[in-house]
Amino acid sequence: IPPHVQKSVNNDMMVTDNNGAVKFPQLCKFCDVRFSTCDNQKSCLSNCSITSICEKPQEVCVAVWRKNDENITLETVCHDPKLPYHDFILEDAASPKCIMKEKKKPGETFFMCSCSSDECNDNIIFSEEYNTSNPD
């Protein structure tokens, strides 16, 4: 932190390493929940025109795709990976790409991904060829 920039006691707006370097915040698509036409595709664009600066530098980009009997929605937000989102841990927060993984939610099909490169939640990937994690 520069000497002329005052330190604050409880500061979650600023992430620093041991040398005092400051982390730049993530730039993420941030349209909250919108109706989507993304269905049965290997990947989709978010069609979100809003790229926001995440409020806290530790936050990453998140996308949530949900399908039920009535509609399909895509949610794009910033979120702190230390905290659960929709009751799920963001396991893939360090990934540069947003690789969708299915989560168990009663009454709907629910996929979620997180990533940590600029606007990475603009391109959401469902294709198995990108997913190198174990199938279980």
Epitope: H4, V5, T16, G20, A21, L27, I53
Partner: nanobody, 124 residues
Framework: EVQLLESGGGLVQPGGSLRLSCAAS???????RMWWVRQAPGKGLEWVS?????????YYARSVDGRFTISRDNSKNTLYLQMNSLRAEDTAVYYC?????????????????WGQGTLVTVSS
């Protein structure tokens, strides 16, 4: 020597406007994403707005979106922040900062990445 020099701060009434400037020298301005960052008294840094080096693509924090406009003049090596509809919570020291493509962390040295700041006070 890298220098970032902010100006344009001052006292303004709620609902008023200010235009901040940041004069850059000592580096290739057109290679850097530029930021406005602010720090309210006793608070942490808040990243307000950013602009790409070429193409002038802009980004805003949700707290200022629709009220603030960032711009740059690459021919003058200058960054601007037009602040409209100012609120008491916008009171802070405003800094400009620079970011190389792909850079995730910023060194703490004020000479490398930070200006000295300009104080904006919004009060009636």
């Amino acid at each position: 020597e890298v220098q970032l020099l902010e100006s344009g701060g001052g006292l303004v009434q709620p609902g008023g406007s200010l235009r901040l400037s940041c004069a850059a020298s000592g580096f290739t301005f057109t290679e850097y994403r530029m930021w406005w960052v602010r720090q309210a008294p006793g608070k942490g840094l808040e990243w307000v707005s950013a602009i790409e080096p070429i193409g002038n693509r802009t980004y805003y924090a949700r707290s200022v979106d629709g009220r603030f406009t960032i711009s740059r003049d690459n021919s003058k090596n200058t960054l601007y922040l037009q602040m409209n509809s100012l609120r008491a919570e916008d009171t802070a020291v405003y800094y400009c900062a620079k970011q190389m493509p792909g850079q995730k962390w910023m060194a703490k040295s004020r000479f490398d990445y930070w200006g000295q700041g300009t104080l904006v006070t919004v009060s009636s």
